[in-house]
Amino acid sequence: KKVVLGKKGDTVELTCTASQKKSIQFHWKNSNQIKILGNQGSFLTKGPSKLNDRADSRRSLWDQGNFPLIIKNLKIEDSDTYICEVEDQKEEVQLLVFGLTANSDTHLLQGQSLTLTLESPPGSSPSVQCRSPRGKNIQGGKTLSVSQLELQDSGTWTCTVLQNQKKVEFKIDIVVLAFQKASSIVYKKEGEQVEFSFPLAFTVEKLTGSGELWWQAERASSSKSWITFDLKNKEVSVKRVTQDPKLQMGKKLPLHLTLPQALPQYAGSGNLTLALEAKTGKLHQEVNLVVMRATQLQKNLTCEVWGPTSPKLMLSLKLENKEAKVSKREKAVWVLNPEAGMWQCLLSDSGQVLLESNIKVLPTW
């Protein structure tokens, strides 16, 4: 007997062909001999089966001797043997309907687990293989699990169900809820305005939740909450903000924070958390602020940086268009009795300048 695989919610067309290429009488029945559908002249007739309002045929094919049974909005329980009776002969087709669903939601937080569950008819023994958007293959039986979802797991998962040497393909769209970047560093000169941006790696119709930015200043012994906010349908409203610093926040996505000026006492690391409505767990993004100050005090020219810098960063002091006078993997450098001219303080990583501050040294008379 012919085997046809179907997908839950889809439409399947079971074929039945007569030797005579003309419209003749036919009937489709299920394994319990209950009439599903047939014809009378140019019209469809329907029996008392549970498929009544989901069964159809194609009248346009009848005069070619084809009498298909179309079943719409397939259910697992539609799995059965269907019998087509035409010209005193019987054609049997076994229909097996499968469903593949994400156990929880298809919108999952980064780091959470994804479980895919296969619904299958009794007596079937299918195998499943899924391919993630980044090309990772996972295999299983009734359930497949992927732990620690990453941002690259966002997208269409393609799963193939194999049964009786036949296969049916499912596509499931998974959205991993995360910030575009896990971490970012902002380099600023003292006194400059600081812009922090927290773009999301996903788009959804309605986004509701609440968030907070905790800040650990390098000079402080403990961290403190700089700002708390609510998100309602992609609109941002500030709930509470510290007096120092007085942060400002954009009203629309992406989440955007402005620090009026970069000061050494603000240099450090922050953690922005976002709790989304109806989701357990939070989204996190780390943000770092490095502040540079160049000063001249009497005969001493000093350049300092505060904040989380890597040990491989180089801090240099140089006179414009000249070789560096001093260059060290430290957070402060100085030059005694600097000659007059425009001095540059540079923070660089493998020759690439991350931050630059200029200071004019006047001639001493």
């Epitope: 009378q40 002249g41 019209f43 469809l44 007739t45 329907k46 309002d53 989901r54 194609r58 009248r59």
Partner: antibody, heavy 121, light 108 residues
Framework: QVQLVQSGAEVKKPGASVKVSCKAS????????INWVRQATGQGLEWMGW????????GSTQKFQGRVTMTRNTSISTAYMELSSLRSEDTAVYYC??????????????WGKGTTVTVSS | EIVMTQSPATLSLSPGERATLSCRAS???????LSWYQQKPGQAPRLLIY???TRATGIPARFSGSGSGTDFTLTISSLQPEDFAVYYC?????????FGGGTKVEIK
């Protein structure tokens, strides 16, 4: 042009029979069904059944089974609907209509003007 | 059998207005199997729409049909004096074919 011409009005007594004719012209009679639809005064449309002029196959709703006979004469491109055991509630205008099967679509595109049948003692 | 229910029974509108007629099937049917007919007093019905949304030959563009499942709609975008009539929906999803009770569109 394509048209269906029906026979004239009839007055019948309860228990009698009536036979309404429907003559087709302007198209190949055997290529399309003829449907019969009736309408009591001030009421809606009620489908009675059909005849396939090519095969002679017919079908009718359960309500009329055993009382209605649908036939055709291909040589004169005419379809007939005979309703027996008439009762007062059969008083209505009886229409014949051409049934078209176009792809998966079926519709009645050409109608006769109707035949008034009055059942009264 | 499938019962077709039309609403409202009567629609009182002025020429130029938009008419929206509803037809509900007692069970889900394919849009392939839904037709609309217009009938004027003393006349035979006239085919307007078949397959839920396809206009029959010679039917003006102001008539449009839509819907799926159990709910279908006939819309007349701007009523003309000749459009005041009774409108019937009809299904041929399966036997017996059934008509709705009709909606009378009358001049306000």
């Amino acid at each position: 042009q394509v048209q269906l011409v029906q026979s004239g009005a009839e007055v019948k007594k309860p228990g009698a029979s009536v036979k309404v004719s429907c003559k087709a012209s302007g198209y190949t009679f055997t290529s399309y069904d003829i449907n019969w639809v009736r309408q009591a005064t001030g009421q809606g449309l009620e489908w009675m059944g059909w005849v396939n002029p090519n095969s002679g196959n017919t079908g009718s709703t359960q309500k009329f089974q055993g009382r209605v006979t649908m036939t055709r004469n291909t040589s004169i491109s005419t379809a007939y609907m005979e309703l027996s055991s008439l009762r007062s509630e059969d008083t209505a205008v009886y229409y014949c209509a051409r049934g078209v099967l176009k792809g998966d679509y079926y519709y009645m595109d050409v109608w006769g003007k109707g035949t008034t049948v009055t059942v009264s003692s | 059998e499938i019962v077709m229910t039309q609403s409202p029974a009567t629609l009182s509108l002025s020429p130029g207005e938009r008419a929206t007629l509803s037809c509900r099937a007692s069970q889900s049917i394919s849009s392939t199997y839904l037709s609309w007919y217009q009938q004027k007093p003393g006349q035979a019905p006239r085919l307007l729409i078949y397959g839920s949304s396809t206009r029959a030959t010679g039917i003006p563009a102001r008539f449009s049909g839509s819907g799926s499942g159990t709910d279908f709609t006939l819309t007349i975008s701007s009523l003309q004096p000749e459009d005041f009539a009774v409108y019937y929906c009809q299904q041929d999803d399966h036997l017996p074919l059934t008509f709705g009770g009709g909606t009378k569109v009358e001049i306000k």
